[in-house]
Every structure is written in C-alpha cells, then in structure tokens.
C-alpha cells in the first residue's frame, strides 16, 4: 500500500534570465527511494538522481541545469519557453512510483520585479 505523500514548491514564478529551484519532498513512507527523475512539461527528462550513483543531467540540459539542493533541481538562464509543468518522479521500493507537480511561470524582468514587490511574506 502506498502511504507516502509528495510536497512540492507548487506554483512558482521567476524572472527571465534568472534561476529557480524546483523542490519536492516525499514523506509518510518508509519506502526506499531508489531514483528521482525530473521531467519537463513535454515529458523530456531533465535529470536523474540515483540513490547510490548520484546525478545524471541530460545532455540537452547540461548548460542550464544544476543538481540540488538535495534532491531538488536548479534551472538557470530561464527563458519564456521554460514556462510550464515540471514533475518529480520518486521511484521507491517497495511502494512504487510517487509523482509531484510544479508549475513554473517565467516572467519578463519588469513583471517579475513588480509582482515580487507585492508578495505577502
């Protein structure tokens, strides 16, 4: 039985040209995490974090994706095309697969600065 739950950073926005951290956290299960896959809205793989072997960043993203912090992923040099859904897929044993969703909106610099000024802390 799958008892775990995934918490994510939810809906986030970031500035064009800037960077953003995507984070997921699996809780409420004793299952062993064997691998965490990070995927983009078009289902292309960004990176794999294997529990024993570390990180593999996909060749197409090596210039713009940095591993971490933790099991998270840092996207750099953001473009408007990076707007969309991102998924963290936790492969666990014996539970199976857990999936979390994050929606990233990349904003033009002036818009991002404007919206940031009015965010509630």
């Amino acid at each position: 039985m799958m008892t775990g739950t995934i918490e994510t950073t939810g809906n986030i926005s970031a500035k064009k040209g800037g960077s953003v951290i995507l984070q997921c956290h699996l809780s409420s299960t004793m299952a062993q995490v064997t691998q965490v896959n990070w995927e983009q809205h078009d289902h292309s793989l960004l990176a794999i974090r294997n529990a024993e072997l570390g990180w593999h960043i996909y060749p197409a993203f090596k210039d713009r994706v940095a591993p971490g912090p933790g099991l998270g992923l840092t996207l750099q040099s953001l473009t408007m095309n990076d707007t969309g859904e991102y998924f963290c897929t936790y492969h666990t044993y014996p539970d199976g697969t857990y999936r979390g969703r994050i929606f990233l909106e990349v904003l033009e610099s002036s818009v991002a600065e404007h919206s940031a000024r009015f965010q509630i802390p």
Epitope: T34, Q35, N37, E39, H43, S44, L45, I48, N50, A51, E52, L53, G54, W55, H56, Y58, P59, H91, Y93, T97
Partner: antibody, heavy 120, light 107 residues
Framework: EVQLQESGPGLVKPSETLSLTCAVS????????WNWIRQPPGKKLEWIGY???????YYNPSLKSRVTISRDTSKNQFSLKLSSVTAADTAVYYC??????????????WGQGTTVTVSS | DIVMTQSPDSLAVSLGERATINCKAS??????VAWYQQKPGQSPKLMIY???YRYTGVPDRFSGSGSGTDFTLTISSLQAEDVAVYYC?????????FGGGTKVEIK
C-alpha cells in the same frame, strides 16, 4: 583504457553459492559504478546489481535475497556471490562499468563474460 | 518491472541499405534508453545513450530516435562489420531492463 576481467568456477552445483570476481585495470573502482549483468541461454540480459564508488549496493529485487556484491579496493576488484543456485542461474555473467554522471544507466565498459553452468 | 520488447527478432539487409530496429517499452520511459551492439563471441558495446546520443567512437551511420514508449535504432548504410545482435535498455527506473535483442544479418 578501462579493462574488466571476470574469473571464477565455470561449474556450480545446485543449492551451492556461485562466486565470481572482476579484476579492473586502468581505472579505480572508487569512482563510478561496478555492475554484474547476466544472460541465460536464449534469454534477455538481466541486471543483477551494482556497487557504487562509495561502496553502496543496489540489487535487482528479483534476486535481492540471494545476492551480495562486495569490493576490495586494495586489489581494485569487486565480487558477486549468488546463493542457493538452480539451473535457472546458468548464464553468461558479465562485469561492467557504468559512468552514471555522463551516460546515466548506460554501461560503457564490459568484461568479456564468463559462462557459469549450474549442474550436479 | 518495465518490459522492453524489440522487433523484429532478426533482420536481413543488403550491404549499403538501411536497417531499422524497434524497441517498445511497457510504460513511458521518456528518453532514458540505451542501445548496444554485440558481435558474435564478444561482449556488448554501448552505441547510443539518452535515446539519441552517439557514444564516443560510434560511426555516424548509427542513429537513435524516439521518446516515451517507442524507440528506433537506425543503421543508415549497413556495413559488413555491423552484423551483430542489437539490444535496447531502459534506465528510467530500477531495475534497469533490456530488450530481447534483434539479430542483423546481410541479405
């Protein structure tokens, strides 16, 4: 150039333990991942498991209760033990290196393979 | 476990002609697929990783494509030295699994 060489008995009796060693030259086993993969006659290649650069192991759940992979860094070699063997464990056994950082789960260096037959 | 199914089991192609090998995953594996070549009496050799990236030293007549569940290895102009068994493998999730192989021969 990375080179891997399997060694061990070619014949093992049912219910006994299969033991193989892989000697690695040209590269340190304290980097990357070191794997055992087998191919029974007429069947698919099957991942048995691996030992990482740090000594952590992963075993295929279908074999987990019978498998142990260990290493000897002073000899730059790693080993496979498979207990309670049956005829279904008859296969060509390969040791292999995997550079996860660059190639993900794709194996870039293989040993030449050693045939193990389980028979009384 | 994810099952990788290759087709056809064997393929006979004339020298200089195109050879196409298919691999189907039982579930979506994105682009976490590798291809290997195994010549008679030898161990497998890595040809393609991440579905479409050629490994070091692999001739450019070999190409990989696909994502999701359907993948293809193409040899654009078959050479005598390409006679071998070709295997696909997924590493989207553990345990990493292989296809059953496709034997490529010369017609």
């Amino acid at each position: 150039e990375v080179q891997l060489q399997e060694s061990g008995p070619g014949l093992v009796k049912p219910s006994e333990t299969l033991s193989l060693t892989c000697a690695v030259s040209g590269y340190s086993i304290t980097s990357d991942s070191w794997n055992w993969i087998r191919q029974p006659p007429g069947k698919k290649l099957e991942w048995i498991g691996y030992i990482s650069y740090s000594g952590n192991t992963y075993y295929n759940p279908s074999l987990k209760s019978r498998v142990t992979i260990s290493r000897d860094t002073s000899k730059n070699q790693f080993s496979l033990k498979l207990s309670s063997v049956t005829a279904a464990d008859t296969a060509v056994y390969y040791c292999a290196r995997l550079d996860f950082s660059n190639y993900g789960g794709a194996v870039d260096y293989w040993g030449q393979g050693t045939t193990v037959t389980v028979s009384s | 476990d994810i099952v990788m199914t290759q087709s056809p089991d064997s393929l006979a192609v004339s020298l200089g002609e195109r050879a196409t090998i298919n691999c189907k995953a039982s579930q979506n594996v994105r682009t976490a697929v590798a291809w290997y070549q195994q010549k008679p009496g030898q161990s497998p050799k890595l040809m393609i990783y991440s579905a479409s990236y050629r490994y070091t030293g692999v001739p450019d007549r070999f190409s990989g494509s696909g994502s999701g569940t359907d993948f293809t290895l193409t040899i654009s102009s078959l050479q005598a030295e390409d006679v071998a068994v070709y295997y696909c493998q997924q590493y989207y999730t553990t345990p990493w699994t292989f296809g059953g192989g496709t034997k490529v021969e010369i017609k």
